[in-house]
């Protein structure tokens, strides 16, 4: 069972001093991180017992395993159901405390009733302030039964519940019809899922025989021990003022556990601490009584004395619950109350005994839950004890349960039950997860969901190249950390599997499912440099670069050109997808912009070192296009162009540029400057006869402007082959600028 205790401080003279504390003895409880599961929750449950709203209660966390509820302002705040939830996953457990008003009309004789399936439960509400009206019983907030006020017996109203079943569990209340619900008697009924002394899915397993008022859990067969007792069967008393499954907690305050109600996981419920009784747990046990609620009787023999916290204290020479066993009777010594082994292991179990006559090897036997008796294979005889060693056959899951070591001599016999937990080694349900990859390493998250039992003590990562028959490489890692697999081959698929282990011999689980993880390409190492660049327009830039010469094949898939516009904070990226390319035309740039330019080699998704940057200033955008361009053949080698100046000029034109191209020709066009911007006509000379030409032109101010429309014209026929076109401006027939 989960080690969870809900403490209620019942010193009720002042509600503001009332508090509830939930204490968890579970490892890491309440921290709320993924590693430890959800935090402790402590709250008032208003679903069944509704009380008028008041100021919100204050929740304070004291360290990782304790939470306290305070801030009760009036007695009615206290009435009702409180719950604490703790433990993680399948072990998440709710502990419930039911608080009754001490001034209620009806009071429960006993708040918590734990009964077995099929039993008759009897809830008894004692009349504290009589009213001559009906008594209404409710179950979990719904009407259940009515009693006439004359039906009280010895000042008590009884509700008999025959043949109870687990669904009958819950909160019951008895209320005078003409009284406030806060004056009700509230009860908690816990119905175990099995008949007396049985547990398990079909109630086929036998309970260990819980001592000192411990209650056998119907799911796992463990004893839920009363506060102040410990051990598999609650056989051992804690020191006064201590509680928790290992007696690790201490009652607060100078008066120890006086005035405290302890609530434990079902099917225990609530009680006073060991040595105390009464509705407010403030009365010490009467002589001869001990334990939680003083429910146990000492009945000490052979001069034993009764201690109200631990029971009989035996004089020298005697032992046993009632000091009924002579020290001459054999006695099992220091047997662990719980042992844990892994499935399919063959453990050795030791059992030591003393007595007079002295126990020998054959007088000590080990009994499994299925009744099989094992005899010891060897015994170590020492002056004060004999230790028998048992070699256990390969363990199966059915071996989980209560084992018994028994010693028999002519002086008598003794036996000690202990719990064996057979744990299933963990097996990953999923493959490990790839976090990041490089050319020679993979970063992997190894911890995955698993079947079987924790805790995980070690994680092994096995890996090898895909389709390889070579041995697996193995790395042992910390369960909570990511793993880097190093010194791998680039661009290679690796099969990766996880193996989990839990503590103890044979704790290694089977390997989990494989997953394929592929390393990245090798990083490109060559650094290009920019050879040059030139502006081919206000928004066009031609860039060229080189790479150093190295032996062997080029590691790279292409180039990435980057242009950084610092003014606007924008980056332009151009992908050149051939590793052989050494030049690129960048278009659609912003005229008049200062760019920082660099180039780098890429391979797969990896980028090599960038070239040293270059700084490029694109000219601003130029003027609009010249208008109404017209071509007229003058001879077999001359064509005259006329045009009109562009409209809405942003400044004075510095020149015009004419583009001449043979129609249908494959060669590059020729650009001719007209350096007299005031002209609106020019003659292009040196053309071939009977040849069709295409012409267009643009103006330049600080930068080149837009192209005009294209015009076509043919030279006249029968001319000689010219050397090439030249241009003549109307006002300047000499000094041709070719």
């Amino acid at each position: 069972a989960v080690d969870l205790t809900l403490l209620a401080n019942l010193r009720l003279t002042d509600p503001q001093r009332f508090f509830l504390t939930c204490v968890s003895g579970e490892a890491g409880a309440g921290r709320g991180s993924d590693a430890w599961g959800p935090p402790l929750l402590l709250e008032k449950d208003d679903r069944i017992v509704r009380t008028p709203p008041g100021p919100p209660l204050r929740l304070a966390r004291n360290g990782s395993h304790q939470v306290t509820l305070r801030g009760f302002s009036k007695p009615s705040d206290l009435v009702g159901v409180f719950s604490c939830v703790g433990g993680a996953g399948a072990r998440r457990t709710r502990v419930i405390y039911v608080h009754n008003s001490p001034g209620a009309h009806l009071l429960p004789d006993k708040v918590t009733h734990t009964v077995n399936k099929g039993d008759t439960a009897v809830l008894s509400a004692r009349v504290h302030k009589e009213k001559q009206t009906d008594v209404i019983w409710k179950s979990n907030g719904s009407y259940f039964y009515t009693l006439d006020w004359h039906e009280a017996q010895d000042g008590r109203f009884l509700l008999q519940l025959p043949n109870v079943q687990p669904p009958s569990s819950g909160i019951y209340s008895a209320t005078y019809l003409e009284a406030s619900p806060l004056g009700s008697a509230f009860f908690r009924l816990i119905v175990r899922g099995c008949g007396a002394g049985r547990w398990g899915p079909g109630c086929t397993k036998e309970c260990p025989g819980c001592l000192h008022g411990g209650v056998c859990h119907d799911h796992d067969g463990e004893c839920v021990c009363p506060p102040g007792f410990t051990g598999t069967r609650c056989e051992q008393a804690c020191r006064e003022g201590r509680f928790g499954q290992s007696c690790q907690e201490q009652c607060p305050g100078i008066s120890g556990c006086r005035g405290l109600t302890f609530c434990l996981p079902d099917p225990y419920g609530c009680s006073c601490g060991s040595g105390w009784r009464g509705s407010q747990c403030q009365e010490a046990c009467a002589p001869g009584h001990f334990g939680a609620d003083c429910r146990l009787q000492c009945q000490c023999q052979n001069g034993g004395t009764c201690d109200r916290f631990s029971g009989c204290v035996c004089p020298s020479g005697w032992h046993g619950v009632h000091c009924e066993k002579s020290d001459r009777i054999p006695q099992i010594l220091n047997m662990a109350s719980e042992l844990e082994f892994n499935l399919e292991t063959m453990p050795r179990i030791n059992c030591a005994a003393a007595g007079n006559p002295f126990p020998v090897r054959g007088s000590i036997e080990l009994r499994k839950p299925d009744g099989t008796v094992l005899l010891s294979t060897k015994a170590i005889v020492e002056p004060e004890k004999t230790t028998a060693e048992f070699e256990v056959p390969r363990l199966v899951l059915a071996d989980s349960g209560f084992w018994e070591c028994r010693v028999s001599t002519s002086g008598g016999q003794d036996s000690r039950r202990f719990k064996v937990n057979v744990k299933v080694p963990p097996v990953p349900l999923a493959a490990p997860r790839l976090l990041t990859k490089q050319s020679r390493q993979l970063v992997v998250s190894p911890l995955v969901s698993f079947s079987g039992d924790g805790p995980i003590s070690t994680v092994r990562l096995h890996y090898r190249p895909q389709d390889s028959t070579m041995d697996w490489s193995t790395i042992v890692v910390d369960p909570s950390e990511n793993v880097t697999l190093m010194n791998l081959r680039p661009k290679t698929g690796y099969s990766v599997r996880v193996q989990l282990s839990r503590p103890g011999e044979g704790g290694e689980g089977a390997w989990g499912p494989p997953t394929l993880m592929t390393t990245d390409c090798p990083e490109p190492l060559l650094q290009p440099w920019l050879e040059g660049w030139h502006v081919e327009g206000t928004d066009r830039l031609r860039v060229s670069w080189s790479l150093p010469l190295v032996p062997g094949p080029l590691v790279g898939d292409g180039f990435l050109l980057r242009l950084w516009d610092g003014t606007r904070g924008q980056e332009r990226r151009e992908n050149v997808s051939s590793p052989q390319a050494r030049t690129a035309l960048l278009t659609g740039l912003t005229p008049g912009t200062h760019y920082q330019l660099d180039v780098q080699l890429y391979h797969c998704t990896l980028l090599g070192p960038a070239s040293p940057p270059a700084h490029v200033l694109l000219p601003p955008s130029g003027p609009p296009a010249p208008r109404h361009l017209h071509a007229q053949a003058l001879s077999d080698s001359e064509i005259q162009l006329t045009w009109k100046h562009p409209e809405a000029l942003p400044g004075p034109i510095s020149k015009y540029v004419v583009e001449v191209q043979v129609a249908g020709g494959a060669g590059d066009p020729l650009w001719i400057d007209v350096d007299r911007p005031e002209e609106t006509s020019t003659i292009i000379r040196g053309l071939n006869a009977s040849t069709r030409y295409l012409f267009r032109m643009r103006a330049s101010i600080q930068g080149l402007g837009d192209w005009s429309n294209t015009v076509e014209e043919s030279t006249l026929g029968n001319g000689l082959q010219a050397e090439g076109p030249v241009q003549e401006s109307r006002a300047a027939e000499e000094g041709l600028d070719q």
């Epitope: 509704r50 001559q132 009206t133 907030g141 009407y143 039906e151 406030s180």
Partner: antibody, heavy 127, light 102 residues
């Protein structure tokens, strides 16, 4: 579905006897207080008698005390009303009804109400 | 014993109108112990309101109850044709149920 079905009514002479039955179904009969309520022709409702779940405790209106006996058989889910020394003023439709108890609004006491009624059976006392 | 009186004895209204029915106790009654019932000719009564103001299961929200002490009211906000019936108030006290005259 909760159902209450009365039977046993009829014509009886003054001083005579009659036994009414009420068969219950659709709920755990043994948990509830049951009542007989009557309604004289053209008149209002009048509570006659109550019986507690155990059957051991009963209540009667002054007008019928000593003449009528309410009882129940929880194993048969049946409520009874034994009427003796009948008078003309006992002429009425007799209804059996179940008492339920509700959480009243706010945080006050529990609120009772007759949440299910039978269809009624007519008792006529006449010479 | 506590006596219950209801007024008016008869209320003549049309569908769509608002009906206000009054119930008075001869001495103070806890609001938890006042209920209202509806009865149509030839039918058994039906629980409408318990605890003076809480609607029973399946009762439309045009029915509402209010009041405390000795004066209680049943209001039907907008009458439907099926609402024309006899209405009884009832109090509980000392383990006894007492009905108004309707």
């Amino acid at each position: 579905e909760v159902q209450l079905l009365e039977s046993g009514g009829g014509l009886v002479q003054p001083g005579g006897s009659l036994r009414l039955s009420c068969a219950a179904s659709g709920f755990t009969f043994s948990m509830y207080v049951m009542k007989w309520v009557r309604q004289a022709p053209g008149k209002g409702l009048e509570w006659v008698s109550s019986i507690y779940p155990s059957g051991g405790y009963t209540r009667y209106a002054d007008s019928v005390k000593g003449r009528f006996t309410i009882s129940r058989d929880n194993s048969k889910n049946t409520l009874y009303l034994q009427m003796n020394s009948l008078r003309a003023e006992d002429t009425a439709v007799y209804y059996c009804a179940r008492v339920n108890y509700y959480d009243s609004s706010g945080y006050g006491p529990i609120a009772p109400g007759l949440d299910y009624w039978g269809q009624g059976t007519l008792v006529t006392v006449s010479s | 014993d506590i006596q219950m009186t209801q007024s008016p004895g008869t209320l003549s209204l049309s569908p769509g109108e608002r009906a206000t029915l009054s119930c008075r106790a001869s001495q103070s009654v806890s609001s938890s112990y006042l209920a209202w019932y509806q009865q149509k000719p030839g039918q058994a009564p039906r629980l409408l309101i318990y605890g003076a103001s809480s609607r029973a299961t399946g009762i439309p929200d045009r029915f509402s109850g209010s009041g405390s002490g000795t004066d209680f009211t049943l209001t039907i906000s907008r009458l439907e044709p099926e609402d024309f019936a006899v209405y009884y108030c009832q109090q509980y006290g000392s383990s006894l149920f007492t009905f108004g005259p309707g």
